[in-house]
């Protein structure tokens, strides 16, 4: 969800910190659009429901995305 009607991109700051997939409530990958010209990855944490902006270029975050997509492919029939 954008921060407001006037601000284009949500992630003012981004994090390189590794995220434990088990601590994730939700992972949103927002593709680049006419509003925000870059991909944004927003992780909603189970604890406190805090939303974190993740660095799409970070090795740790790329590994997280791989782990999550692997988990999703296991679950899908």
């Amino acid at each position: 969800v954008p921060l407001s009607r006037t601000v284009r991109c949500t992630c003012i700051s981004i994090s390189n910190q590794p995220v434990n997939p088990r601590s994730l409530e939700k992972l949103e990958i927002i593709p680049a659009s006419q509003f925000c010209p870059r991909v944004e990855i927003i992780a909603t944490m189970k604890k406190k429901g805090e939303k974190r902006c993740l660095n799409p270029e970070s090795k740790a975050i790329k590994n997280l995305l791989k782990a999550v997509s692997k988990e999703m492919s296991k679950r899908s029939p």
Partner: antibody
């Protein structure tokens, strides 16, 4: 430790220009968006400007729009505020502040401030 | 522009007492509200973001609550170092980001 240090404050005449700097250390500057916030003597806090972590997006308070420009040099770990056409009402302590590393807008690390006085 | 009104302007209390500070928004800001503490001659310090999340290193005696237009910062038991000015700040529908006028918590 994580630190922000502002510099460049001075006494200037109305209509003149000034550039403030904010040197960051102890954290990965290139992943943080940054703000300028000011405080007139004896008054409350006023947000001035923001710049995204990669410098792509910038927004300003109406009171400084078209006069002030925020920029960020990630290779030098430094934030800047170019202030043109200064007015008496710009007199304040100017703080640089780091945006928190969550999908929110809040200032989790502040500099000590630098005083700008606009007076003839 | 969203206007934040803080009350009371001055709160006179003794150490050990409970402090309740109010911040009211001119329109709904959802949970997009932060609280800061500022001592004389110092920069502000982030206490609470997103209405109720304590910032790193902030003691548990500080808590935030509320959503929409009415918010509260509670200090459960005032310590001597808690006497300061407190500001609320919103980020709904920004720019601009706006701050309240502040509440000064002073020693009775």
């Amino acid at each position: 430790q994580e630190q922000l240090v502002e510099s460049g404050g001075n006494v200037v005449q109305p209509g003149r220009s000034l550039r403030l700097s904010c040197a960051a250390s102890g954290f990965t500057f290139s992943t943080y968006g940054m703000h300028w916030v000011r405080q007139a003597p004896g008054k409350g806090l006023e947000w001035v400007a923001v710049i995204w972590y990669d410098g792509s997006d910038k927004y300003y308070a109406d009171s400084v729009k078209d006069r002030f420009t925020v920029s960020k040099d990630n290779s030098k770990n430094t934030l800047y505020l170019q202030m043109n056409s200064l007015r008496a009402e710009d007199t304040a302590v100017y703080y640089c502040a780091r945006n928190i590393a969550v999908a929110d807008v809040a200032f989790d690390l502040w500099g000590q401030g630098t005083m700008v006085t606009v007076s003839s | 522009e969203i206007v934040l009104t803080q009350s009371p302007a001055i709160l006179s209390l003794s150490p050990g007492e409970r402090a309740t500070l109010s911040c009211r928004a001119s329109q709904s800001v959802s949970s997009y509200l932060a609280w800061y503490q500022q001592k004389p001659g110092q920069a502000p310090r982030l206490l609470i973001y997103d209405a109720s999340n304590r910032a790193t290193g902030i003691p548990a005696r500080f808590s935030g609550s509320g959503s929409g237009t009415d918010f509260t910062l509670t200090i459960s038991s005032l310590e001597p170092e808690d006497f300061a000015v407190y500001y609320c700040q919103q980020r709904s529908n920004w720019p601009p980001l706006t701050f309240g006028g502040g509440t000064k918590v002073e020693i009775k």
